[in-house]
Interface confidence: low
């Protein structure tokens, strides 16, 4: 009798193939697209998730004003190159040899160039601002209840250490969640804020990445919190390098 489970699946990533060929006959899972072994006790890196997604069949006062250097992911989906640890490679290129530099969450941070473009290092996204607008409710949510529920969600569902949830702002109907995680703060085993934000984004869109779990059912004191739009801003440790043409557009 081996330690393999009957239901050999990956709870934290449905975009995997699993078989009981790990040590002791236990379940081991590999990400679709890359074939990389993944750690199913925690979140899979955004790079591997994007790669798996691309390989799948196609069918005001208290609110934070995003910095002028904040990035929004306007480029949408692409098939990324991931390093052996599952992180984004600093330089990404498409099939037509168009290349660009990305940050640690895979968002473009330079103008597009050709194969001669150099991206010296993977710049860390250390501050993520998740901007949500919730559907109308009878009254505003209690701020402290909302704060506690969102912190609980990131701690329990995404296993993000509470110290990385810097703040939760609320000015009906806008909710802002600030995640902060410097390179020096992130210890081995800590979930990356970029990965947590991506799982949250997919949950909010009703596209949960968790295996077999129901979709996200967010409630504050029993009252459903339904999100009607999401914007995510990414701030890097080094400001992005775009030409003036783009900045004035």
């Amino acid at each position: 009798h081996t330690a393999a489970q009957d239901n050999c699946t990956c709870p934290t990533n449905k975009m995997t193939v699993c078989s009981p060929d790990g040590p002791g006959g236990r379940c081991q899972c590999r990400a679709l697209g890359s074939g990389m072994a993944v750690d199913c006790s925690t979140l899979t890196s955004k790079c591997l998730l994007l790669k798996a997604r691309m390989s799948a069949p196609k069918n005001a006062r208290t609110l934070v004003r995003p910095s002028e250097h904040a990035l929004v992911d306007n480029d949408g989906l692409y098939d990324p190159d991931c390093d052996p640890e599952g992180r984004f490679k600093a330089r990404q290129c498409n099939q037509t040899s168009v290349c660009w530099c990305v940050n640690s969450v895979g968002v473009r941070r330079t103008d597009k160039g050709d194969l001669s473009l150099r991206c010296d290092e993977l710049v860390r996204t250390h501050h993520i601002l998740i901007d949500l607008r919730h559907r109308p409710t009878a009254g505003a949510f209690n701020h402290s209840d909302l704060d506690a529920e969102l912190r609980r969600l990131f701690r329990e569902r995404y296993r993000l250490h509470p110290k990385f949830v810097a703040a939760v702002h609320y000015e009906q109907p806008t909710i802002q969640i600030e995640l902060r995680q410097n390179t020096s703060q992130k210890a081995a085993g800590d979930v990356d804020i970029g990965d947590a934000a991506y799982y949250f984004e997919r949950d909010i869109k009703g596209e949960s990445l968790f295996q077999g779990r129901g979709g996200l059912d967010l409630r504050v004191r029993g009252e459903p919190l339904q999100v009607e739009r999401t914007l995510i801003y990414y701030l890097d440790e080094i400001p992005p390098k775009f030409s003036m043409k783009r900045l004035t557009a």
Epitope: H1, A3, A4, Q5, D6, N7, C8, T9, C10, P11, T12, G22, P23, G24, R26, C27, Q28, C29, A37, V38, D39, C40, S41, A188, G189, G212, R213
Partner: antibody, heavy 119, light 112 residues
Framework: QVQLQESGPGLVKPSETLSLTCTVS????????VNWIRQPPGKGLEWIGV???????NYNSALMSRVTISVDTSKNQFSLKLSSVTAADTAMYYC?????????????WGQGTLVTVSS | DIVMTQSPDSLAVSLGERATINCKSS????????????LAWYQQKPGQPPKLLIY???SRESGVPDRFSGSGSGTDFTLTISSLQAEDVAVYYC????????FGGGTKVEIK
């Protein structure tokens, strides 16, 4: 929140079968495995066995011939049966939830129930 | 079966000083696929169930003070308490989960 609670008779006679129940709440029995661990008075921890989320079981090879772990999903209960007990089976018995797909760690434990084997 | 050997059996350390506990496994606990070591550390205080401190050999469980750290790979592992506090008096156990589960014999940490 996640909770586990062991229950059962505190006293069992030698050669009889020890039967304990672990009642769980706050999580799905089909998503997590539950382990049984025991600790004789003043001694260390000994893993007894596990029922994986899929329903299969594994046992400590030293106890395998005497142990059975089962589940009653309608009652959210796991049970442990240890046959032909002796004084050496006197211990605090804990149930603990697997915190991982392959059971790498136990983050949630019951408070334990003390079982004494004596005539 | 994998055998886990802890040393020392007991340890007396002054408040604020470093405490180091060793754990040795009879075979490697490193999964080359996921590059993870299947080793956890637990703390048990009298009359209480064990509490998870460290998993994957070096990952600190949420809420565990950062004075606790785990290190090592393969067959040799260490739990370090960088600055012992009064509330750290307890028995500490390592546990392998590479092939089913085995606990080490425990190390009792006391104040000198």
């Amino acid at each position: 929140q996640v909770q586990l609670q062991e229950s059962g008779p505190g006293l069992v006679k030698p050669s009889e079968t020890l039967s304990l129940t672990c009642t769980v709440s706050g999580f799905s029995l089909t998503s997590y495995g539950v382990n049984w661990i025991r600790q004789p008075p003043g001694k260390g921890l000994e893993w007894i066995g596990v029922m994986w989320a899929g329903g299969s079981t594994n046992y400590n090879s030293a106890l395998m011939s005497r142990v059975t772990i089962s589940v009653d999903t309608s009652k959210n209960q796991f049970s442990l049966k240890l046959s032909s007990v002796t004084a050496a089976d006197t211990a605090m018995y804990y149930c603990a939830r697997d915190e991982n797909w392959d059971g790498a760690w136990f983050a949630y434990w019951g408070q334990g129930t003390l079982v004494t084997v004596s005539s | 079966d994998i055998v886990m050997t802890q040393s020392p059996d007991s340890l007396a350390v002054s408040l604020g000083e470093r405490a180091t506990i060793n754990c040795k496994s009879s075979q490697s606990l490193l999964n080359s696929g996921t590059r993870k070591n299947y080793l956890a550390w637990y703390q048990q205080k009298p009359g209480q169930p064990p509490k998870l401190l460290i998993y994957w050999a070096s990952s600190r469980e949420s809420g565990v003070p950062d004075r606790f750290s785990g290190s090592g790979s393969g067959t040799d592992f260490t739990l370090t308490i960088s600055s012992l506090q009064a509330e750290d008096v307890a028995v500490y156990y390592c546990k392998q989960s590479y092939n089913l589960f085995t606990f080490g014999g425990g190390t009792k940490v006391e104040i000198k």
